[in-house]
């Protein structure tokens, strides 16, 4: 059983490997099976690994680029999990988030169709305010910290790519 | 009817400044972002800058950023262009263009033009 | 930026036949299937007129003898039989990423 498991994960690891030549992998519990990978520099975070993409880009080239390492833009589920991806952010640049209103009519939709919950939604005061403005990112204003911002899809930005940890 | 119309042109020394006004008509000119684009006599047409409908927010390529500034009154329903520390460069036929979004808003076009107004940067 | 590449810089057609334009972009233009590619026609002294956009869809009271198709970096523009009143200069344009950009424009005229 074990050793089917182990066959498992490494044909798993070898789809990855195009990308992630590297991972780095911790013990989630006692168990020699209980590890789990995230591809070496992204960071974890409970299930998921995360990435900061420097390269500036429209929303659109870098949903594809972080489509291409088996990934999506970010979809941040909790207060907790933004905390974390703010860490690693620089409070001059902005960045993409997985989260776009195609019809103009507020209606969000994050990437990888987790329903949208505007009770966990975390948006700057007055935000979002422009109709045409359909792609949103995350940002830091001196007098709410961090927060989102509804702006042009085609205007290029940083961008936070995430995907589930391999186990 | 959508009407677009540029006003402000005109003869300018290299160094001057020069304000450029498009009064729009026909539409909701405050849900709508807007574009300034000129081409150069003979040439192309190049873009010089976008506001976002409330006009929070501003674009516009290095061959001019610093030197210009776009805004808009969208109670008067209109859009202006601040040109300081003009070049012979410069020098063109300035339209005002709207913003028409498709694809979810992942891309536009500019759906509507006005006539044009001329800036010649000249000493 | 993304450079866009228009070929031929003017093209010379007899009334009534097909002509054809292309325009070549640096970089994907594309998500999803959907391109970001615009055609725009510009009469001498007039200001451009929006003819195609999303590469292929022919804006509203636009003659349907044009025709814009292509994805990824190659697009065309199609004037299935060209009339006295097509003779302009016609320019591709994308809106992918900022700056948008515009080709170099291929003027059309009558042969």
């Known amino acids: 059983f074990m050793y089917s498991k182990t066959v498992k994960r490494l044909s798993k690891l070898r789809e990855y490997q195009q990308y992630h030549p590297s991972l780095t992998c911790v013990m989630e519990g006692k168990d020699i099976e209980d590890w789990s990978c995230c591809p070496t520099p992204w960071t974890s975070f409970q299930s998921s690994c995360y990435f900061i993409s420097t390269g500036m880009q429209s929303w659109t080239k870098s949903q594809k680029n972080c489509s291409v390492m088996g990934a999506d833009l970010v979809v941040i589920n909790t207060r907790e999990e933004q905390d974390f991806i703010i860490q690693n952010l620089k409070r001059n640049s902005s960045y993409f988030l997985g989260l776009s209103d195609p019809g103009g009519r507020r209606h969000w939709q994050w990437v990888d169709q987790t329903p949208y919950n505007e009770n966990v939604t975390f948006w700057h005061s007055g935000e979002p305010n422009n109709l045409d403005e359909r792609c949103a990112i995350i940002n830091f204003r001196s007098s709410e910290e961090w927060g989102w911002n509804d702006i042009h899809c085609h205007v290029p930005q940083k961008s936070i790519c995430k995907m589930k940890k391999i186990y | 009817e959508v009407q677009l119309v540029e006003s402000g042109g005109g003869l300018v020394k290299p160094g001057g400044s020069l304000r450029l006004s498009c009064a729009a008509s026909?539409?909701?000119?405050?849900?709508?972002?807007m574009s300034w684009v000129r081409q150069a006599p003979g040439k192309g047409l190049e873009w010089v800058a976008y506001?976002?409908?409330?006009?929070?927010?501003?674009y516009y390529p290095d061959s001019v950023k610093g030197r210009f500034t776009i805004s808009r009154d969208n109670a008067k329903n209109s859009l202006y262009l601040q040109m300081n520390s003009l070049r012979a460069e410069d020098t063109a036929v300035y339209y005002c263009?709207?913003?028409?979004?498709?694809?979810?808003?992942?891309?536009?076009?500019?759906?509507?033009w006005g006539q044009g107004t001329l800036v010649t940067v000249s000493s | 930026d993304i450079v866009m590449t228009q070929s031929p810089d003017s093209l010379a057609v007899s009334l009534g036949e097909r002509a054809t334009i292309n325009c070549k972009s640096s970089?994907?233009?594309?998500?999803?299937?959907?391109?970001?590619m615009n055609w725009y026609q510009q009469k001498p002294g007039q200001p451009p007129k929006l003819l195609i956009y999303?590469?292929?869809t022919l804006e509203s009271g636009v003659p349907s003898r044009f025709s814009g198709s292509g994805s990824g970096t190659d697009f065309t523009l199609t004037i299935s039989s060209l009339q006295a009143e097509d003779v302009a200069t016609y320019y591709c344009?994308?809106?992918?990423?900022?700056?948008?950009?515009f080709g170099g424009g291929t003027k059309v005229e009558i042969k």
């Open positions: 970089q994907s233009v594309d998500y999803d299937g959907d391109s970001s």
């Open positions: 026909g539409f909701t000119f405050s849900s709508y972002t």
């Open positions: 344009q994308q809106t992918n990423e900022d700056p948008p950009t």
């Open positions: 263009a709207r913003h028409d979004y498709y694809d979810g808003g992942l891309y536009y076009a500019m759906d509507y």
């Open positions: 506001i976002s409908s409330g006009g929070g927010n501003t």
């Open positions: 999303a590469a292929s």
